[in-house]
């Protein structure tokens, strides 16, 4: 067992080294480890094959370090890995698209608060078991087409607190099991009418605190399971172009937030849902 760590066998074979001031992944981690806790240290680099000997590893926590680089082969051989927490490593900024390849059992991936500016092509390729993907509080500006296409079992996708300015047509392709999509506190000004086409099981959609002045109801039509919708804190324009959204909200049987109008001035601060159809005039 490495000097700064505590190792024990019950309930799972565990190597625990949190908040020890470690500057590198310690050598001598027992090969039988099923759980490795390295969070809260000063680790800046995860070299290739750092955990290759740990074939039984199911949980790896590296959050709250100072990671600036993760080698593309850092997690090679971890075919049984289920939880990987890399959150709160603000200097990371980018992740090689091959980093997570081969992690076919991974069900939870934390990449929140990592300073990520983009999601490279194929970053999540092959992660068929993934259920929870945390990407909030980064610096993402765009959602490239088909980024999440292989994630057919994903249920939770957290993208809030980024700089995303639009939701393109193919951003969420393949997310047939998605239950919760959190897109609030971004800069979204435009949602493609077909952006949510595959999200027939979505129950929760947060789009509040964005830059939406309108939302095509065609985008909401596929959301047959939707129960919770938050649209507040957007600069909604409540003129005749808002009538389709107003009509959709009247029929919506789930729980929706207020939809406060910003324009025209006479309707500012009033809830679109509570307006009468003839309030929505002039284009």
């Amino acid at each position: 067992c490495p000097g700064a760590c505590v190792c024990y066998n019950e309930p799972k074979v565990t190597t625990s080294c949190p908040q020890q001031g470690l500057q590198a992944v310690p050598v001598g981690i027992p090969a039988a480890s099923q759980r490795i806790f390295l969070h809260g240290n000063r680790i800046s680099h995860v070299p290739a094959a750092s955990f290759r000997a740990c074939r039984n590893l199911t949980i790896l926590w590296l959050h709250s370090n100072v990671l600036a680089r993760i080698d593309a082969a850092a997690f090679t051989g971890l075919a049984l890995l289920e939880q990987l927490d890399l959150s709160d490593n603000a200097q990371l900024r980018s992740v090689d698209p091959a980093t997570f390849h081969g992690l076919g059992r991974l069900h939870t991936l934390h990449l929140d608060r990592c300073g990520l500016q983009e999601l490279g092509p194929g970053l999540f390729r092959g992660l068929a078991a993934l259920q929870y993907l945390y990407l909030q509080d980064n610096a993402l500006q765009a959602l490239p087409d088909d980024t999440f296409r292989d994630l057919g079992n994903l249920t939770h996708l957290f993208l809030h607190g980024n700089r995303i300015s639009s939701v393109p047509e193919r951003a969420f392709r393949g997310l047939h099991s998605l239950d919760r999509l959190l897109l609030h506190q971004n800069r979204v000004a435009h949602v493609h009418p077909h952006a949510f086409r595959d999200l027939g099981r979505l129950m929760t959609l947060y789009l509040f605190a964005n830059n939406l002045s309108a939302l095509p109801t065609e985008a909401l039509a596929p959301l047959r399971a939707l129960q919770y919708l938050r649209l507040n804190d957007n600069p909604w324009v409540c003129d005749c172009r808002a009538r389709p959204l107003w009509a959709w909200l009247q029929k919506f049987r789930g729980s929706s937030s207020e939809v406060p109008c910003s324009l025209p001035q006479r309707l500012a601060g009033r809830d679109l849902k509570r307006l009468a159809a003839n309030d929505l005039q002039g284009c």
Partner: antibody, heavy 127, light 110 residues
Framework: QVQLQQSGPGLVRPSQTLSLACTVS??????????WTWIRQHPGKGLEWIGY???????YYNPSFMNRVAISIDSSKNQFSLNLSSVTAADTAVYYC???????????????????WGQGTLVTVSS | QAVLTQPSSASGTPGQRVSISCSGS????????VNWYQQLPGTAPKLLIY???QRPSGVPDRFSGSKSGTSASLAISGLQSEDEADYYC???????????FGPGTKVTVL
């Protein structure tokens, strides 16, 4: 540490407009995702939520105030304001400004709370 | 008329445990987090408990919050004379799209 300082007249004539300002110190009013909120309390009674304006400048008002209320934000002065028009004696109350913080939990649940609060301004509507 | 329901008063002797209930519905307490505010005489309300059971720094650990279904409660264990105040529960209401409060409970230290 953020502090809120209220200012405005304590006496307003019926049918006139009540105007109060809340100056934020300790941070920029435009930083973060907050909801700058006004709440009032009738003498000896409970609290009533009036509305908010977000750091992005989007207002939302309690429907019970109909079209009488307007909340605005002035980043250059680091303050936000409440205007309540066509006041009557029923609008006599202590008015508080406060900041709503929102936090998203790991489960995607939104947690929101009001903190800090201004000192309160007793506004009497009387001729 | 307050949307949430609280007892108008509660009392106890120093050191005692006092509990205040707050009852609502599925559209407020049932689906959102509950906060508690303390208002000492002649002062502005102060955040006491947020997110159901979290205490801001500076709030003594004798204050605790809990929630079950459409009801919440605030417990004060080891009541002290400085706890004499009005206590308000609050939650967002998804039907009204408003922040709603209880009418307040006046706690008296005997």
């Amino acid at each position: 540490q953020v502090q809120l300082q209220q200012s405005g007249p304590g006496l307003v004539r019926p049918s006139q407009t009540l105007s109060l300002a809340c100056t934020v110190s300790g941070d920029s009013i435009s930083s973060g995702d907050y909801y700058w909120t006004w709440i009032r309390q009738h003498p000896g009674k409970g609290l009533e939520w009036i509305g908010y304006i977000s750091t992005r400048g989007s207002p939302y008002y309690n429907p019970s105030f109909m079209n009488r209320v307007a909340i605005s934000i002035d980043s250059s002065k680091n303050q936000f304001s409440l205007n309540l028009s066509s006041v009557t004696a029923a609008d006599t109350a202590v008015y508080y400004c406060t900041r709503e913080t929102q936090h998203t939990s790991i489960f995607g649940v939104i947690h929101n709370w009001l903190d800090p609060w201004g000192q309160g301004t007793l506004v009497t509507v009387s001729s | 008329q307050a949307v949430l329901t609280q007892p108008s008063s509660a009392s106890g002797t120093p050191g005692q445990r006092v509990s205040i209930s707050c009852s609502g519905s599925s559209s407020n307490i049932g689906s959102n987090t509950v906060n508690w505010y303390q208002q000492l005489p002649g002062t502005a309300p102060k955040l006491l408990i947020y997110s159901g059971n979290q205490r801001p720094s500076g709030v003594p650990d004798r204050f605790s919050g809990s929630k079950s279904g459409t009801s919440a409660s605030l417990a004060i264990s080891g009541l002290q004379s400085e706890d004499e105040a009005d206590y308000y529960c609050a939650a967002w209401d998804d039907s009204l799209n408003n922040l709603v409060f209880g009418p307040g409970t006046k706690v008296t230290v005997l």
